[in-house]
């Protein structure tokens, strides 16, 4: 029952947190005009993966797509590239989870078939997670390298004269949407792997005690026997460590002086 | 450098008309939003038209019917031609455009004013 529910609540908070992924990767605000000094700007731009924005006084907001490929900074290409891998292992990983979810029966799917695909899902959850919490924290690297160039810009002009016409740009929605998102697909994989475990079939070592009654006296044998539960070879009781207990089938104990009841 | 450059000022009858002209220099990247304001002697600067990128224009109430704003193709420049032009138009004109700096990432738009051209309509 609780590896039914890890692995369920594993699917289901790792299906939020690729949706999450997905949201912060369409985006338009993953940087914002830092507002500090001009709270009350005519102009407000911001920037996503894809297109760059600005919304005017009036209300009105154009958006624009980069139309150029190579006039666009390394770092973004990667940040596109580990958001965009992120969501393909995450999907993957989705759709392999859902046929692996403990409640859902297909065919004679065998427990550790369940537990294999359990396990692939969870690792893909993990990398997917880890791959969007890359992203947007290399982009959140860029934005506090340029944030801080910018600053210096400013300050460094003319006989110290500030530059009005240099924008600087902060965090956006998008980072925190992409940091969160990743941290639960992230928790959901972990979830999905510590499921694996319990659905895998083990074998189980028990202490058995082997009780033989002998005329007046009773013997009293400590003894390992191991339990199968049917996946293993070992179906019959036969004897694991010798720990001077035999098995019934074995010779019959006979009364000694120092066996007393 | 970008710069406003408004031309079309004049002083003109009552009932007559006149062409305003704001041109965008120094290779902006395109506008998005471009437009007339107007500041009467001991008034407030309000908006007369705007123009979107997308095409869509929007008019004072004082103004509709009587003023048409236009764009000319490929260039930042647009015009106000203004008919039936009354007493209470008399107004120092502004030429307002946000334009972009780049079609680039990090490359961001800012709110550009023209140094105002004179209408003066008597009565």
């Known amino acids: 029952m609780a590896v039914t529910a890890c692995q369920g609540l594993g699917f289901v908070v790792s299906l939020i947190g690729i949706a999450g992924i997905i949201a912060a990767t369409c985006m338009d605000q993953w940087s914002t005009q830092d507002l500090y000094n001009n709270p009350v700007t005519a102009v407000f731009n911001y920037q996503g993966l894809w297109r760059s924005c600005v919304r005017e006084s009036s209300g009105f907001t154009e958006c624009r797509g980069y139309f150029t490929l190579l006039g666009l900074p390394a770092m973004l290409q990667a940040v596109r590239a580990l958001m965009i891998v992120g969501i393909v292992l995450g999907a993957i990983g989705l759709l392999v989870s859902i046929f692996a979810l403990k409640c859902i029966r297909i065919g004679s799917m065998e427990d550790s078939a369940k537990a294999n695909m359990t396990l692939t899902s969870g690792i893909m959850f993990i990398v997917s997670g880890l791959c969007a919490i890359a992203g947007v924290s290399v982009f959140a690297n860029m934005l506090v390298t340029n944030f801080w160039m910018s600053t210096a810009n400013m300050y460094t002009g003319m006989g110290g004269m500030v530059q009005t016409v240099q924008t600087r740009y902060t965090f956006g929605a998008a980072l925190f949407v992409g940091w969160v998102a990743g941290g639960l697909t992230l928790i959901g994989g972990v979830m999905m792997c510590i499921a694996c475990r319990g659905l895998a079939p083990e074998e189980t070592n028990y202490k058995a005690v082997s009780y033989h009654a002998s005329g007046h006296s009773v013997a009293y044998k400590p003894g390992g026997f191991k339990a199968s539960t049917g996946f293993g070879s070992n179906t019959k009781n036969k004897k694991i460590y010798d720990g001077g207990a035999r098995t019934e089938d074995e010779v019959q104990s006979y009364p000694s002086k120092h066996d007393y009841v | 450098q970008v710069q406003l450059v408004e031309s079309g000022g004049d002083l003109v009858q009552a009932g007559g008309s006149l062409r305003l002209s704001c041109a965008a220099s120094?290779?902006?990247?395109?506008?998005?939003?471009m437009g007339w304001y107007r500041q009467a002697p001991g008034k407030q600067r309000d908006m007369v038209a705007t123009?979107?990128?997308?095409?869509?224009?929007t008019y004072a109430d004082s103004v509709k019917g009587r003023f048409t704003l236009s764009r000319e193709n490929a260039k930042n420049t647009i015009h106000l031609q203004m008919n039936s032009l009354k007493p209470e138009d008399t107004a120092v004109y502004y030429c307002?455009?946000?334009?972009?700096?780049?079609?680039?990432?990090?490359?961001?738009?800012?709110?550009?004013w023209g140094q105002g051209t004179h209408v003066t309509v008597s009565s």
């Open positions: 307002r455009a946000v334009l972009r700096s780049g079609d680039n990432w990090m490359a961001a738009a800012n709110e550009y």
């Open positions: 120094g290779s902006p990247f395109g506008f998005v939003v």
């Open positions: 123009l979107t990128s997308s095409g869509a224009t």
